[in-house]
Amino acid sequence: ELCDDDPPEIPHATFKAMAYKEGTMLNCECKRGFRRIKSGSLYMLCTGNSSHSSWDNQCQCTSSATRNTTKQVTPQPEEQKERKTTEMQSPMQPVDQASLPGHCREPPPWENEATERIYHFVVGQMVYYQCVQGYRALHRGPAESVCKMTHGKTRWTQPQLICTGEMETSQFPGEEKPQASPEGRPESETSCLVTTTDFQIQTEMAATMETSIFTTEYQ
C-alpha cells in the first residue's frame, strides 16, 4: 500500500532511505534540457519474490532539443541476454539482496538524471533525517520517520528532530548521526495499528553509518 503523503518536512533538514520496500516507485526524472524518451517508463518499481528484490523498468533521458537518438554502449557480458542497453538507461539491480529481504537497494544512476530523486513510498518504509549544512541537530528522540497504516489510513510518524542555526564550536553542522536503535522508537500508538518496522535495517544502519562493510556494485 502506497503512503498517501510524503515524509514529514522538517525545517532545515533532509531525509534519506537506506533501502526501499517492495512496492516503492521512483519517478524517472530528467535534468533540465532533457526529457524521458517517448514510450519510456514513467517510474521504476521495486518488485520481488521470496529470494530477491529488484527494480523493474528502466529510466531513459534524451535531449529535449534532439530526436530520440540514444548512443549505444556495449552491455556487460552477463547482461547481453537480458536486454539491449543504452547509455541513457539505468542498469539492472544486482540479484544479491540477501542482506535486506523484501527491499531494493539504491537504484543506480542513469544518464542525465535529475539531481533530486522523487520516491513514492509504501507502508513500513523508514526514512532518516539529518540537518542540512549550517544547522545542527537538537534531538528529542529518534531522527527518523516510518510510514504506518492506522484505521485504514497511512501516516508518517513525526521525527523527533529540531535543526537550529546556532553553531556549536565542537560540532560540524548536523553532525549527530541518525538514531538507529529500535529501543528509542516511539511505538506507543497501538490501537488499530499495523506496522512493519524493519529492525534489520536499523541494525545495519547503525553499522553502516560508522564503517561500510558490505557494498553492492552496480554493473
Epitope: K16, M18, R105, F172, K177, M209, T216
Partner: nanobody
Framework: EVQLVESGGGLVQAGDSLRLSCAAS????????MGWFRQAPGKEREFVAT????????YYADSVRGRFTISKDNAKNTLFLQMSSLRPDDTGVYYC??????????????????WGQGTQVTVSS
C-alpha cells in the same frame, strides 16, 4: 568550511596499483554520497566512481569497472579509490567530489557542490 583533500597519487607502471584517499571536513560526511572524477590532459573531466551515503552501494564508469573500487569510511571522514591493473589511459588528475544535499549519487558534475584540488596519477607503459 567544506574541505576535500586528495592524496595517494603518483607515477606508477602499467599493471600496478594505487590507493587514493580523500580527507573530508566541514560537513557531515556520513550523510552524503561521494564520487571520484578524473581529467586527462586535454580532455574534459569525467566520472570514475560514486558511492551512496551509507557506503553500501557503488557505481563505476565502464572503463574502470572491475579494476577500481570506491569505498568510504564514515567514522574517519575519508573516501578511498583503490585502483588496480592501471593502464596508461588512466593517467590524469583525480578529483574527489561531494554530492549535493539532496543528490543520491555523485554521478555527474551537476550532482556535486564541492571538489578537491586533485591528485595526479601517471601510468607509464
Amino acid at each position: 568550511e567544506v574541505q576535500l583533500v586528495e592524496s595517494g597519487g603518483g607515477l606508477v607502471q602499467a599493471g600496478d596499483s594505487l590507493r587514493l584517499s580523500c580527507a573530508a571536513s566541514g560537513f557531515n560526511f556520513g550523510w552524503h554520497a561521494m564520487g571520484w572524477f578524473r581529467q586527462a590532459p586535454g580532455k574534459e573531466r569525467e566520472f570514475v566512481a560514486t558511492i551512496t551515503w551509507t557506503g553500501r552501494d557503488t557505481y563505476y564508469a565502464d572503463s574502470v569497472r572491475g579494476r577500481f573500487t570506491i569505498s568510504k569510511d564514515n567514522a574517519k571522514n575519508t573516501l578511498f579509490l583503490q585502483m588496480s591493473s592501471l593502464r596508461p589511459d588512466d593517467t590524469g588528475v583525480y578529483y574527489c567530489a561531494k554530492a549535493r544535499e539532496r543528490a543520491t549519487w555523485a554521478y555527474s558534475e551537476d550532482d556535486c557542490d564541492y571538489w578537491g584540488q586533485g591528485t595526479q596519477v601517471t601510468v607509464s607503459s
